[in-house]
Structure formats: structure tokens, C-alpha cells
Amino acid sequence: GELETSDVVTVVLGQDAKLPCFYRGDPDEQVGQVAWARVDPNEGIRELALLHSKYGLHVNPAYEDRVEQPPPPRDPLDGSVLLRNAVQADEGEYECRVSTFPAGSFQARMRLRVLVPPLPSLNPGPPLEEGQGLTLAASCTAEGSPAPSVTWDTEVKGTQSSRSFTHPRSAAVTSEFHLVPSRSMNGQPLTCVVSHPGLLQDRRITHTLQVAFLAEASVRGLEDQNLWQVGREGATLKCLSEGQPPPKYNWTRLDGPLPSGVRVKGDTLGFPPLTTEHSGVYVCHVSNELSSRDSQVTVEVLDPEDPGKQVDLVSAS
């Protein structure tokens, strides 16, 4: 006869491990008992359980309520046991010793491997600002047994670097993603991908990139000269910029206060029916937490009664 077993039994933390030990013998042979032991390099052999053909299952007190026989129907030649709720400390070598009649004793050893799936965490780096050099965008850490694989999935151009720390029963892997921040990266996903044999599928954590920037400001609204004549209605100046965080807009007049009736609505300056009093230099001030920009325009309202005059447009930033 011979024992059918496995060299390695792999189980995920918290699951039940089946330690296989099946005696393949002649029809007239009987199994009297199967003794299970944990083989520890330091502590030697520690008894785990005994499956006895007459007495039944004995479980060592250290494994009380954790060792069972597989559910019926059971073959009398099957000495397999279930180790419930495997923990990391269960990892190691196990031995089954089968006493048969009349063939004698057989033994086999197997290794129990307990996979500890990682629970990854993603930590964003310091605030990203356009104009910075190579900067940490995010770091991702995952600890497990064996060591997990940590990579990045993104369309953003950058560099990744990994380091690992080995603990007695696990390994922690940290991967960092560095990039040169630009406004085109804003809102782009940066995904940490953790692979591990204890996971049915990769674990993914996505971080949305936020890059602080403020674009140059410009003013639109003076393109059509016919709008800027005395008596015309609906004339507006719009300040153009973009930024992250979204900027705030402020309008002022360089050569005095804003004329009465001129309304400020965020990035837009609205004029009442135009008079020559509305002529002047207007300044759009754009700002966010990162920076501020100015753009100024000179408005001259043309009086149709004075054909010699034309609208003069000067823009400066």
C-alpha cells in the first residue's frame, strides 16, 4: 500500500485547510489509526489529532474545536482532517502516520501554506502644483504573505519605485508613483493594483489626480466695435482663465471706481446702455490658492455723432 497526500496544501487565511492522507491498499487491509502531528523545527513533533478506527477522533487540547474529520460519507481508509479557520501560525509542516493491518505503518509529510491576502492602502502625496519638478503623486502599501505585487495603472506619464519590508510571517510592499505635475493630468485616474495568490482578483484603489494651476487671463468682448457705441445695450466683458482650484474673479477700473449701473457677475462685467462715461481701463483679477493673474483692457465708447472717433482696443496682461 501507499499514502496519497499532497506536498503542499495552500489555504487562504480564515479558510479551512484539508490535510489529505489517504491509504491506498489492498482490499483486505485495514487502517487502525491515523496520527497527525505538527513538525516544528524548534519544538519537534507536536501531536495534533488521532483518528482511531474504534475510538474515533481525538483532538489535542491546543487544537480543540479546530480539527475535524471531513463530512460523511467517509472512506475508512481516508485519514484526512480539516483544520478550521487557518491562521498564519498554522503555517508549517504536518505529518500523518498511518497504522495498518497487516501491512504496518506508513507516514507522509506535507507543508501547509497560509496565504494572507493584503489589504492595500493608498496615500496621496503632497498637493501637486504645476511648475513643480518630479513630485510624489501617491504611495500604495500592501502587506501579505507571501509578498504582494504592487503596480500602477494610469495614462499619466510618471515613474514608479517599490520597496519591501519583511516581517516574520509577512512582507509589506510600498510602491510610490512620481510625476512632473501638469494641468493635463488634472482629474486623471491613478490606480494602485495589488496582486496576490490569495486574491481571486486584483485589488484596485483609484486616486484622482488634482494638479493646482492658474492659466493666463484674457478678456473677451471688445471684438465687435459696433457694440461699443453710445446707447448700445448688452455690452459685456468676459474674463477668460481656468484653474484648479477653480479661480475667483474680480473686476476693477484702473482710473476710478466702476461706473454706476455696471454689474459684476463672476467672470463677466455687464454694462448698462453705453455712454462715453463707460470709457476707461478695466482690470480683471483672477486668483486661486496657487496664484493670481491680471488682464486689462481699454474701452472707448464711440459717439456716432462724432464720426472721427473710433473704438480703440488695447489689451495688456
Epitope: Q33, A35, E47, Y55, L57, H58, R97, S99, S105
Partner: antibody, heavy 126, light 107 residues
Framework: EVQLVESGGGLVQPGGSLRLSCAAS????????MSWVRQAPGKGLEWVSA????????YYADSVKGRFTISRDNSKNTLYLQMNSLRAEDTAVYYC???????????????????WGQGTLVTVSS | DIQMTQSPSSLSASVGDRVTITCRAS??????LAWYQQKPGKAPKLLIY???SLQSGVPSRFSGSGSGTDFTLTISSLQPEDFATYYC?????????FGQGTKVEIK
């Protein structure tokens, strides 16, 4: 025929010592674990101690741990129980018994006692 | 330690009666249970091992059953030589422990 014969019992004062012997015959002595079981007058059975076939492993009831020592001489087919610091509550008939040999190489469990000696009376009294 | 509780502690019966003695363990012991018979002034004698296996030479009127925590010794038809004290014993753990005994007396 399996035979177990105890000897060495008698009257001893509290704090005294006594050594019990059990001569075995009719079986391969070294192949069997052996036990001592006692029975106080008019009382039930109490397991005292056990020893593996080789003598390498010994086991004791808490009530006698540190005072009693079990041993065996396989060349003489004899089991011993050295009893020190005896107390009145140790008064009992002491039986040696053979453990049934149908569990092999597994020390965590004892086995039934299939053969017993006739017993020897130990009386601890001043 | 595992506690073994026998009931009844004594019983009176007549020759030919069916007698049942029960034994309860304080925790599960699979079938690691033996039954012994002891007559006055004599050593105990193994009757049943592994809860239900009859020891060689023991009359078939003795039988045992149970597993886990509850066990029974049955004498199907009591004979004059069966009047004695009966003990159950667990050997699942060290120390092995005995029940307090059941004395079977003549009615």
C-alpha cells in the same frame, strides 16, 4: 497468561516513603504502557500515574505530582511507584494495570486498562 | 479535567432483568470510553472499550453504546455473577477519569 502482581504496600507514617513494585509476566512488557490506579476504602477508582512502554514518557495526577515517581525496568519486567511525602489521603489499595495497546505512537491519549493486578494496600497513619 | 457522571449511583434488580447504566462526560470524548466491573475485594475487570466494543471473554449480554458525551452500559439479562459495581472511564485526555460508580444489588 497475563499476570500482574503488586507488592510493597504497608503501614507508613505521614511524611514517610514507600516503594511499590509490580511484577509482570505473560506478555512483552516493553511493548505496553502501564498505569497505577488507586482506590480509597469504600470509594471509587482514581488514576494515579502512567508510563510509556519505553519509559520515556511519564504522566501524573495533580494530587500526586511532585511526590510520586513512576518508573520501569524492562529488563526485569517490573513497574515501580516511588511514593514520598505520604499523606493520610493517600491511603488506598494501589493497583498496577496494563494499557490496551491499540493506540500506537500517540501520547496524548491513554488507552483502556485491560489487565489489573490484585492490588496492594497502603495505609498512611500515625 | 473531564468529569464523568454516572447514574444511578446504585440500583436493585432481579436475575433476568434488563439493566441500564448511563455515563455522561463533561465534554466530548468521541468513543474514548471504557466500562469496568468490580466485585468486592477484587480488581476491576475491563468489559467494554471504545464505547461499544466487547472485551475478549466478556459475555455478550453486556453491551455499550453512545459517543460524544452520553454513554450507556446495558446488561440484557442480569445474571447472579453480575451483581457488582460498574465504572465508566474516559481516556480521551490525561488524566483519565472514572465515574463515581454504580452499585448493582440484588432486589
Amino acid at each position: 497468561e497475563v499476570q500482574l502482581v503488586e507488592s510493597g504496600g504497608g503501614l507508613v507514617q505521614p511524611g514517610g516513603s514507600l516503594r511499590l513494585s509490580c511484577a509482570a509476566s505473560g506478555f512483552t512488557f516493553s511493548s505496553y504502557a502501564m498505569s497505577w490506579v488507586r482506590q480509597a476504602p469504600g470509594k471509587g477508582l482514581e488514576w494515579v500515574s502512567a508510563i510509556s512502554g519505553s519509559g520515556g514518557s511519564t504522566y501524573y495526577a495533580d494530587s500526586v505530582k511532585g511526590r510520586f515517581t513512576i518508573s520501569r525496568d524492562n529488563s526485569k519486567n517490573t513497574l515501580y511507584l516511588q511514593m514520598n511525602s505520604l499523606r493520610a489521603e493517600d491511603t488506598a489499595v494501589y493497583y498496577c494495570a496494563r494499557e490496551y495497546s491499540d493506540v500506537v505512537d500517540y501520547v496524548s491519549v491513554r488507552t483502556p486498562l485491560d489487565y489489573w493486578g490484585q492490588g496492594t494496600l497502603v495505609t498512611v497513619s500515625s | 479535567d473531564i468529569q464523568m457522571t454516572q447514574s444511578p449511583s446504585s440500583l436493585s434488580a432481579s436475575v433476568g432483568d434488563r439493566v441500564t447504566i448511563t455515563c455522561r462526560a463533561s465534554q466530548g470524548i468521541s468513543s474514548y470510553l471504557a466500562w469496568y466491573q468490580q466485585k468486592p475485594g477484587k480488581a476491576p475487570k475491563l468489559l467494554i472499550y471504545a464505547a461499544s466494543s466487547l472485551q475478549s471473554g466478556v459475555p455478550s449480554r453486556f453491551s455499550g453504546s453512545g459517543s460524544g458525551t452520553d454513554f450507556t452500559l446495558t446488561i440484557s439479562s442480569l445474571q447472579p455473577e453480575d451483581f457488582a459495581t460498574y465504572y465508566c472511564q474516559q481516556h480521551y485526555t490525561t488524566p483519565p477519569t472514572f465515574g463515581q460508580g454504580t452499585k448493582v444489588e440484588i432486589k
